[in-house]
Amino acid sequence: QTSVSPSKVILPRGGSVLVTCSTSCDQPKLLGIETPLPKKELLLPGNNRKVYELSNVQEDSQPMCYSNCPDGQSTAKTFLTVYWTPERVELAPLPSWQPVGKNLTLRCQVEGGAPRANLTVVLLRGEKELKREPAVGEPAEVTTTVLVRRDHHGANFSCRTELDLRPQGLELFENTSAPYQLQTFVLPATPPQLVSPRVLEVDTQGTVVCSLDGLFPVSEAQVHLALGDQRLNPTVTYGNDSFSAKASVSVTAEDEGTQRLTCAVILGNQSQETLQTVTIYSFPAPNVILTKPEVSEGTEVTVKCEAHPRAKVTLNGVPAQPLGPRAQLLLKATPEDNGRSFSCSATLEVAGQLIHKNQTRELRVLYGPRLDERDCPGNWTWPENSQQTPMCQAWGNPLPELKCLKDGTFPLPIGESVTVTRDLEGTYLCRARSTQGEVTRKVTVNVLSPRYE
């Protein structure tokens, strides 16, 4: 009678096992083992027992011990069960972002692993079991559906295999897939609100604000603001479920015309976009042109106002005739025109909005000098020892230089407070001089002595 020990073995794939073949007869003609596995006989004294080392066991096998005794041939099988954990435990790839309210199908694939009767596949959210099924098929596939909730945000979904060999006196072998971290989101159906100037002048800055409510998680929302091809760099402030993105926009002559302002909000794998048109315009201030900015009294002066070809101008409140981008007026320069402002106002319509620009120029009229009785009296009579201020104002543009001299040397202190003495008496020649010429005027100072009172 042939016997085998052990009769049943569970061993790791690629492992080795010692199998003892024994026979009950003392002098067997033959005692051996039949197996396709690599084998070594571990020698023992005696004829009725042989020990074999079977190695590199890759799959379940049934080596057979045999013996040939005088009373006949007999055999005994040992059952080798190979165990190995799966080579692949994988969750089917999914977009990491999932909208709240969507049904999400988790699919776990398991390749390999044995014995399959002891292999279970478990789908988990964190440590919570969602589904548990035996591994069936190659690859084994287990699926479950999850309704995505807001509180699933950041949850880790995974797939675990359990090779339970505890009934065989071994342990529970677990393999876990790489986790799938779910990012849930809510992006409202309403487009973002975009507040910006409808028109924007070249070489100026404007402010654009884009905002949206009802987002989750708001901190993950990406905001893209652009004017044409120009990406704007907004400062984003977040509320509980809202954001406001504020950006400065600068435009140049190259941007002139109608441009598209875009605000796109991207959350998860969805986006909402708002478009608005902004008209970029160039409108220089009107040009006020004087024949000459500085003219002599009596000169004919032409004042012209020129503006943007589509603008309408008024010059000193008088609309151009006909209404258009140019206006002019003619005048003969008088001293009263010196310092006179000529103001041109231009109005341009851009995208239904009226834009106003002004420009002012001042006319300088050169005249004089002038010395007249009103401003430079010809005769003064002052009591001796009294405090007086001699006054003589010369007029003209440029302002003339004024000197009053007695006998060509003694000056009259114009505009200064003086004590009247006998020396002050006499006739002074006041001379006003400027680039425009020279005028003179005699001024007499009389001093009243106390003895004549």
Epitope: K40, E41, L43, L44, P45, E53
Partner: antibody, heavy 116, light 107 residues
Framework: EVQLVESGGGLVQPGGSLRLSCAAS????????IHWVRQAPGKGLEWVAR????????IYADSVKGRFTISSDDSKNTAYLQMNSLRAEDTAVYYC?????????WGQGTLVTVSS | DIQMTQSPSSLSASVGDRVTITCRAS??????LHWYQQKPGKAPKLLIY???QSISGVPSRFSGSGSGTDFTLTISSLQPEDFATYYC?????????FGQGTKVEIK
């Protein structure tokens, strides 16, 4: 009947070499493992090396690694232990043994003396 | 390396005595423990393999037990031919190692 016979021992100077042979009969060495075990005079047993004659896989004790080489010749059903760079502490009776894990069959042993 | 420690190192006993020799491993070696008997000038002889498995031709008074780290060789009734040195050996991991031996002498 299983039999193992060692030969090749003798007196050798430190730094010298010796080659021990182990002739097997009664079994095919390819079907099992061959080991060398030594015993210094008056001391205990020390495992030295193992060969799997079927594929020439070898394993050595740290004390002899790099100096001793175990080999086999299937056609002669013989195993060998080439000993180089011998030291005084290698002085021992060298046994070849057959089987694996345990040592069921032993040769009579051959004495190696390393001395100047 | 796994250290094997035998105790006692030597013992004196009389014919008919029950003799127990212990062997302790420095770490668990399951049942990968074998016992040998060596007489002066002779090669060792295998007595027990795998801690407790008997060998054909070895008298039944020799038995082994133990698992893990602690093992015992028992000679139930000592006979005159049993006076020798006994060694344990582990085959759990390389290098294989022997105990230092226990010498059984006549009292």
């Amino acid at each position: 009947e299983v039999q193992l016979v060692e030969s090749g021992g003798g007196l050798v100077q430190p730094g010298g070499s010796l080659r021990l042979s182990c002739a097997a009969s009664g079994f095919n060495i390819k079907d099992t493992y061959i080991h060398w075990v030594r015993q210094a005079p008056g001391k205990g047993l020390e495992w030295v090396a193992r060969i799997d004659p079927a594929n020439d896989n070898t394993i050595y004790a740290d004390s002899v690694k790099g100096r001793f080489t175990i080999s086999s010749d299937d056609s002669k059903n013989t195993a060998y232990l080439q000993m180089n760079s011998l030291r005084a502490e290698d002085t021992a009776v060298y046994y070849c043994t057959a089987s694996g894990y345990w040592f069921a069959y032993w040769g009579q042993g051959t004495l190696v003396t390393v001395s100047s | 390396d796994i250290q094997m420690t035998q105790s006692p190192s030597s013992l004196s006993a009389s014919v008919g005595d029950r003799v127990t020799i212990t062997c302790r491993a420095s770490q668990s070696i399951s049942n990968n423990l074998h016992w040998y008997q060596q007489k002066p000038g002779k090669a060792p002889k295998l007595l027990i393999y795998h801690a407790s498995q008997s060998i054909s031709g070895v008298p039944s008074r020799f038995s082994g037990s133990g698992s893990g780290t602690d093992f015992t060789l028992t000679i139930s009734s000592l006979q005159p031919e049993d006076f020798a040195t006994y060694y344990c050996q582990q085959s759990n991991s390389w290098p294989y190692t022997f105990g230092q031996g226990t010498k059984v002498e006549i009292k």
